[in-house]
């Protein structure tokens, strides 16, 4: 260090520290090969290994593959960062019916409220459109401001009613989003370092390619770096990001150095069999009749509930996708959970899974 620099600027002669003029303080010198987790590391724990591109460093200090959002019906919500996975969500005009870690396994188009119903809550990437009965004496088409406006950014114009939910078999169960908490927890990790004041001064999407030589001593820019299309997972392992290269998949969020790519079914298809950060099997979207009505939800795990229409009418859902192939799963996690209001019109216990029979009539799903 220069002799004319104040004594404290030399960090008291401590070789394991260096003086950062920008923050005017002594910083811990990360060992070669490790990257700092913040602009001015203070201790060894502030240094990390560098994962490959498209991998992220998870909470257990493992390089884990970021999910991909390459399926047509997915868009990237947050990029793959050094310490968090890429997060995918359903593209505008669709909502997630079956969640996957950092992604959505199954996206459906937002439903259009049928005749006699109006939009109560517009659809989002997480929730389907919520419909409610139009007030008597008011034109159904303009019963609320939402119905007299252009579709919101979360919806797309529809020339004909869009399916409100898929049917899955002759006793088809309605999909209910599962694994939301996992996705929410993963998403919450995105706030850890990339955008926090203590983070390194570069965007979270930066894979950390800056050092072209072995990490210079004192540069503090050396973290475990995974291969491209891998991310540093929570265990600190480099884990492969899922691939969305199948024709029926689109990328929802890209693979980042610290978060996985997430994939979802392309528009017009729904996920019949979920997979981590992706969908194992996509099937064409089924069609539901106009009488099926959506209701708001209290639980985050449920995208939509369906209120039974007034007595004397029955929902009429096409139970099979266009290609005749029915989704495989009829597990309770994909079943319709009837809320307390719906249970007033149907003699079914609250929270009981309900399926649509081949005739479209609600039946109790024993699970």
């Amino acid at each position: 260090f220069p002799q004319d620099r104040p004594f404290e600027d030399t960090c008291h002669g401590n070789p394991s520290h260096y003086y950062d003029k920008a923050v005017r303080r002594c910083c811990y010198r990360c060992p070669m090969g490790l990257f700092p987790t913040q602009q001015c590391p203070q201790r060894p724990t502030d240094c990390r290994k560098q994962c490959e591109p498209d991998y992220y460093l998870d909470e257990a200090d493992r390089c884990t593959a970021c999910v991909t959002c390459s399926r047509d019906d997915l868009v990237e919500k947050t990029p793959c960062a050094w310490n968090s996975s890429r997060v995918c969500e359903c593209r505008p005009g669709m909502f997630c019916s079956t969640s996957a870690v950092n992604s959505c396994a199954r996206c459906f188009f937002h439903s259009v409220c049928p005749a006699g119903m109006i939009v109560k809550f517009p659809g989002t990437a997480q929730k389907n459109t919520v419909c409610e009965p139009a007030s008597p004496g008011v034109s159904p088409a303009c019963a609320s401001p939402e119905n007299c406006k252009e579709p919101s950014s979360g919806t797309i114009p529809q020339a004909k009613p869009t399916p409100v939910s898929p049917a899955t078999s002759s006793a088809s169960t309605m999909p209910v989003r599962g694994g939301t908490r996992l996705a929410q927890e993963a998403a919450s990790k995105l706030t850890r370092a990339p955008d926090s004041p203590s983070s390194v001064g570069r965007p979270s999407s930066d894979p950390g390619l800056s050092p072209t030589q072995p990490c210079p001593e004192g540069s503090g820019d050396c973290r475990k770096q995974c291969e491209p299309d891998y991310y540093l997972d929570e265990a600190g392992r480099c884990t492969a990001c899922v691939s969305c290269s199948r024709d029926d998949l689109v990328e929802k969020t890209p693979c980042a150095w610290n978060s996985s790519r997430t994939c979802e079914c392309r528009p017009g298809m729904i996920c019949a069999t979920s997979a981590t950060n992706s969908c194992a099997r996509c099937v064409p979207y089924p069609i539901c009749a106009a009488e099926t009505v959506t209701k708001p939800q209290d639980m985050a795990e449920k995208d939509t509930t369906f209120e039974a229409p007034p007595l004397g009418t029955q929902p009429d859902c096409n139970p099979t996708p266009e290609n005749g192939e029915a989704p495989a799963s009829t597990s309770p996690t994909q079943s319709l959970l009837v809320d307390s209001q719906a249970s007033k019109t149907l003699p079914i216990p609250t929270s009981a899974p309900v399926a649509l029979s081949s005739t479209g009539k609600p039946v109790l799903d024993a699970g």
Partner: antibody
Framework: EVQLVQSGAEVKKPGSSVKVSCKAS????????MNWVKQAPGQGLEWIGQ????????NYNGKFKGRVTLTADKSSSTAYMELSSLRSEDTAVYFC????????????WGQGTLVTVSS | EIVLTQSPATLSLSPGERATLSCRAS??????????MLWYQQKPGQPPKLLIY???NVESGIPARFSGSGSGTDFSLTISSLEPEDFAMYFC?????????FGGGTKVEIK
Amino acid sequence: EVQLVQSGAEVKKPGSSVKVSCKASGYAFSSYWMNWVKQAPGQGLEWIGQIYPGDGDTNYNGKFKGRVTLTADKSSSTAYMELSSLRSEDTAVYFCARRINGNFAMDYWGQGTLVTVSS
Amino acid sequence: EIVLTQSPATLSLSPGERATLSCRASESLEYYGTSLMLWYQQKPGQPPKLLIYSASNVESGIPARFSGSGSGTDFSLTISSLEPEDFAMYFCQQRRKVPSTFGGGTKVEIK
């Protein structure tokens, strides 16, 4: 000076295993990925996998996964590649190589270890 | 996996001539604004030696006559004026996807 020194040539029987070592010096062994590359006689290069000695994290080429195990001993700054169920096509020179952080290049290589599989 | 195709397989040239080696990837090697393409030189009985990283960056200590170019899927290594010690095998490598893969190699031999 960075150096990677590999163990000597090996002759093995089909079905057996071989463990090649790579002793590193001159740098922070724990903080750099150690890659392993195969080169069959007169052939090109084939990436086997890599290990991060700091925590034992690994990436493998699927072609070798199941038969190759990469390990590292931080105390001796030595990386190991063990190949099991040997067959004749495993006859090759095996290199260890340090991977640079940042651009993923392999800047320092071991001298190579010839493994001959013959009955 | 990404397939790298090098051409030509053999390049017969004289010292002082310009050598251009090609490497084509089966998919893009772009990654956050850089191409994860590497070039190595290998001589008989020796390990490969890093020449070029990130498609166009010359490794420290490598003579300036070596240069790399290209992006996406098409890359090339150029030796502006061949020296006797440049006659060797050259391999391209991609690090964009695991598994990392190498090209089949181009042998630069004396004409």
